[in-house]
């Protein structure tokens, strides 16, 4: 397998409104060097959900649960979920540069929101 893999194990996640959603992502290598970012949606109109280095994301916390040697955990938790948060979330590895360029995306996790 050439270079790294971005693994989003959950195809879908269902969360009740007001609860928190955990979106899992593991990456098999730090190489090529570059950040991990989370987006909702795909294409040029996608919405940035979390970027470790810059920005203010008050509802997002990082959730590292994996202690396995073979991968690293870049999962996030989004608090106080509302119906407006529904959509497909992508964990994306970037290659460091000027500017950073998208290297590989996970397959996506579809978040659906249930009524309370």
């Amino acid at each position: 397998e050439e270079e790294l893999q971005v693994i989003q194990p959950d195809k879908s996640v269902s969360v009740a409104a007001g609860e928190s959603a955990i979106l899992h992502c593991t990456v098999t290598s730090l190489i090529p060097v570059g950040p991990i970012q989370w987006f909702r949606g795909a294409g040029p109109a996608r919405e940035l959900i979390y970027n470790q280095k810059e920005g203010h994301f008050p509802r997002v916390t990082t959730v590292s649960e994996s202690t396995k040697r073979e991968n690293m955990d870049f999962s996030i938790s989004i608090s106080n979920i509302t119906p407006a948060d529904a959509g497909t979330y992508y964990c994306v590895k970037f290659r460091k540069g000027s500017p950073d360029t998208e290297f590989k995306s996970g397959a996506g996790t579809e978040l659906s929101v249930r009524a309370k």
Epitope: S64, T67, S75
Partner: antibody, heavy 118, light 111 residues
């Protein structure tokens, strides 16, 4: 059993060149990021170069950039470090090391000694 | 560059007692809750050997008297109880950002 065996070290004059090799066995070489780390009594451990599992991406610290070139041959389970324009400060024991995740150094070879002196 | 400062430079501990080594990074080595700090043991005439990866995870085959803790900039390697075969130099290493850097080492001896 994982084995990393370095070769190619020796005595070279300042400005000269050397090519270090690392022969890997006992693991799936093509799945691993590979690196060289050197050690001197004065400066301790210093990262020297890293190459991605497929060989596409290479990284170097400023101290060796433009002088050292890292390559690999996955068909031969081998790693190579071409060192040009060598300086006295490059004198060190050079270790080949594997990194499954491109993070921690999992396995290390026994090292090969490079001495740069006139 | 992230500068790694290890302390003490040397440490003498009685057999069966606790040895504690500290490593401080000049900036955070955390990302998404992962601490990209690792610990190695090096005995004379041998290459370094991975003990602890990502701050607190024990490498396979390493005795559980070794443990690691810490986050962001401050990390600790603990050996408890210290055994005769633990006499060695211990190094911390960060892989959070290039260039990857190492601490200066801590030499552990028996008192």
């Amino acid at each position: 059993e994982v084995q990393l065996v370095e070769s190619g070290g020796g005595l070279v004059k300042p400005g000269g060149s050397l090519r270090l090799s690392c022969a890997a066995s006992g693991f799936t070489f093509s799945s691993y990021v590979m690196s060289w780390v050197r050690q001197t009594p004065g400066k301790g451990l210093e990262w020297v170069a890293t190459i991605s599992s497929g060989g596409t991406y290479t990284y170097y610290p400023e101290s060796v950039k433009g002088r050292f070139t890292l390559s690999r041959d996955n068909a031969k389970n081998s790693l190579y470090l071409q060192m040009n324009s060598l300086r006295a400060e490059d004198t060190a024991v050079y270790y080949c090391a594997s990194q499954l995740t491109g993070s921690e150094f999992d396995y290390w070879g026994q090292g090969t000694t490079v001495t740069v002196s006139s | 560059d992230i500068v790694m400062t290890q302390s003490p430079a040397s440490l003498a501990v009685s057999l069966g007692e606790r040895a504690t080594i500290s490593c401080r990074a000049s900036e955070s080595v955390d990302s998404y809750g992962n601490s990209f700090m690792h610990w190695y043991q090096q005995k004379p005439g041998q290459p370094p050997k991975l003990l602890i990866y990502r701050a607190s995870n024990l490498e396979s085959g390493v005795p559980d008297r070794f443990s690691g803790s810490g986050s962001r900039t401050d990390f600790t390697l603990t050996i408890n109880p210290l055994q005769a075969e633990d006499v060695a130099t211990y190094y911390c290493h960060q892989s959070a950002d290039l260039p990857w850097t190492f601490g200066g080492g801590t030499k552990v001896e028996i008192k």
